[in-house]
């Protein structure tokens, strides 16, 4: 997260860290007791490493009573996701067992109504991604408040030049932005999961390159079918 600040500890109990060989790779969001939603491209970077999900964490390194690392029973990328595009950049991870729920571990309701979030709406994005262009990685969860950007502006030639589909949404990126390591994390508006940070190698913090988020409402049928 660029231009953000440390989050209040455990105030986002849905927040997950998708880890490979014990290292944070991507963000994720608990959407059901045994399921974490993340970004499909995160798996590409996992290679043959052991994928696990950390729940109940604020600090990645410090001991916390609510922290627990779960093995992944099954990884389900969206069937139409491709390495060369950010389309359908969603991944569902089934935990090896149901998460132990508590004040620091709770699923987040996700948007099912397939309607665009009003441009200008301030939404919360959080993650353990880099906090500087130099690549400094935080130990504690960071967050930032970002205004939703209308799709037409986001699709301008000077911005994302038509790449933003109806199944994506954008948020402003003027110095405040999600960045590398935040992919797969939640964009929360009005207490509901609206978007998932896409995992392209986009430049961060440049207002001409807004943050791109996969709209979960557009994938309600797929999410339901996997969770069923």
């Amino acid at each position: 997260i660029l231009g953000g600040r440390e989050a209040e500890a455990h105030a986002r109990p849905y927040m997950a860290s998708v880890q490979v060989n014990g290292e944070h790779l991507c963000g994720g969001v608990l959407v059901a007791e045994q399921w974490v939603l993340s970004a499909a491209h995160c798996l590409e970077d996992a290679a043959d490493g052991k994928v696990q999900v950390l729940l109940g964490a604020h600090s990645l390194s410090q001991p916390e009573p609510s922290k627990r690392l779960y093995d992944v029973l099954r990884a389900v990328p969206h069937p139409d996701s491709r390495p060369d595009t950010i389309d359908h950049d969603l991944l569902l991870l089934q935990l090896s067992e149901k998460a132990t729920l508590g004040p620091a571990v709770r699923p987040l309701p996700w948007q099912r109504v397939d309607r665009d979030v009003e441009p200008g709406t301030l939404c919360d994005v959080a993650g353990w991604g880099i906090v500087s262009h130099a690549g400094r990685r935080p130990d504690r969860l960071q967050h930032v408040l970002l205004p939703v950007l209308d799709r037409a502006t986001c699709n301008r030639r000077t911005h994302h030049d038509g790449a933003i589909t109806q199944r994506m949404m954008c948020a402003e990126s003027n110095r405040r932005d999600s960045c590398k390591g935040d992919s797969g994390g939640p964009l929360v508006c009005g207490g509901v999961l609206e978007g998932v940070v896409t995992s392209g190698s986009r430049v961060c913090g440049n207002r001409k390159k807004p943050g791109i988020y996969t709209r979960v409402a557009s994938y309600a049928a797929w999410i339901d079918s996997v969770l069923a």
């Epitope: 600040r5 916390e64 919360d124 508006c189």
Partner: antibody
Framework: QVQLQQSAAELARPGASVKMSCKAS????????MHWVKQRPGQGLEWIGY????????DYNQKFKDKTALTADKSSSTAYMQLSSLTSEDSAVYYC??????????WGQGTLVTVSA | DIVMSQSPSSLAVSVGEKVTMSCKSS????????????LAWYQQKPGQSPKLLIY???TRESGVPDRFTGSGSGTDFTLTISSVKAEDLAVYYC????????FGAGTKLELK
């Protein structure tokens, strides 16, 4: 300095609803959750729930889940709690409170709700 | 939920006296990973909001007089006032933040 200013006392009829407010100042409103605590006359403290004003996420004590609705207005740095289907059991002082780390370091002055026919 | 039990429910004291009050939790509030007890104490004077006194079971909040001391570990905790002043007459609550937030029923400190 951190201040939490709560709305005035409310007198309500059984079955009615009330909505109280808690205006925050002295810090960035969206950086901290706002919690609500109930205190019946001469009784102890009960945690109701919280709202994270940044994304609007809420979490409730199961006991109060159907009774209360927590909202927040980022533009005015104000948190709200609505109590519905009021009964005499809801007559109490309601506090908004902000944590520092894990404990409540900052409290509003309380809003007294009296439910009476 | 973790249940917090405070005793006694009320306590009549004289100014200058040493006072101890107890708080017991239904499960341990000590986290072995950091050796911290997830417990706080608050003071509430009549007609006022609660005020934080102690956190991590024994760390005094800034500005709180050193006559207030928190001690204990696991499930048994104590708040001690070494020499009571008239201004200390209040209700004292313990509060656990290990899991869903719960408070004790309070100990009322009254003048003899």
């Amino acid at each position: 300095q951190v201040q939490l200013q709560q709305s005035a006392a409310e007198l309500a009829r059984p079955g009615a609803s009330v909505k109280m407010s808690c205006k925050a100042s002295g810090y960035t409103f969206t950086d901290y959750t706002m919690h609500w605590v109930k205190q019946r006359p001469g009784q102890g403290l009960e945690w109701i729930g919280y709202i994270n004003p940044s994304g609007g996420y809420t979490d409730y004590n199961q006991k109060f889940k159907d009774k209360t609705a927590l909202t927040a207005d980022k533009s005015s740095s104000t948190a709200y709690m609505q109590l519905s289907s009021l009964t005499s059991e809801d007559s109490a002082v309601y506090y908004c409170a902000r944590r520092r780390d894990y404990w409540f370091a900052y409290w509003g002055q309380g809003t007294l709700v009296t439910v009476s026919a | 939920d973790i249940v917090m039990s405070q005793s006694p429910s009320s306590l009549a004291v004289s100014v200058g006296e040493k006072v101890t009050m107890s708080c017991k939790s239904s499960q341990s509030l000590l986290y072995s990973g950091n050796q911290k007890n997830y417990l706080a104490w608050y003071q509430q004077k009549p007609g006022q909001s609660p005020k934080l006194l102690i956190y991590w079971a024994s760390t005094r909040e800034s500005g709180v007089p050193d006559r207030f001391t928190g001690s204990g570990s696991g499930t048994d905790f104590t708040l001690t006032i070494s020499s009571v002043k008239a201004e200390d007459l209040a209700v004292y609550y313990c509060h656990q933040y290990y899991s869903y937030l719960t408070f004790g029923a309070g100990t009322k400190l009254e003048l003899k």
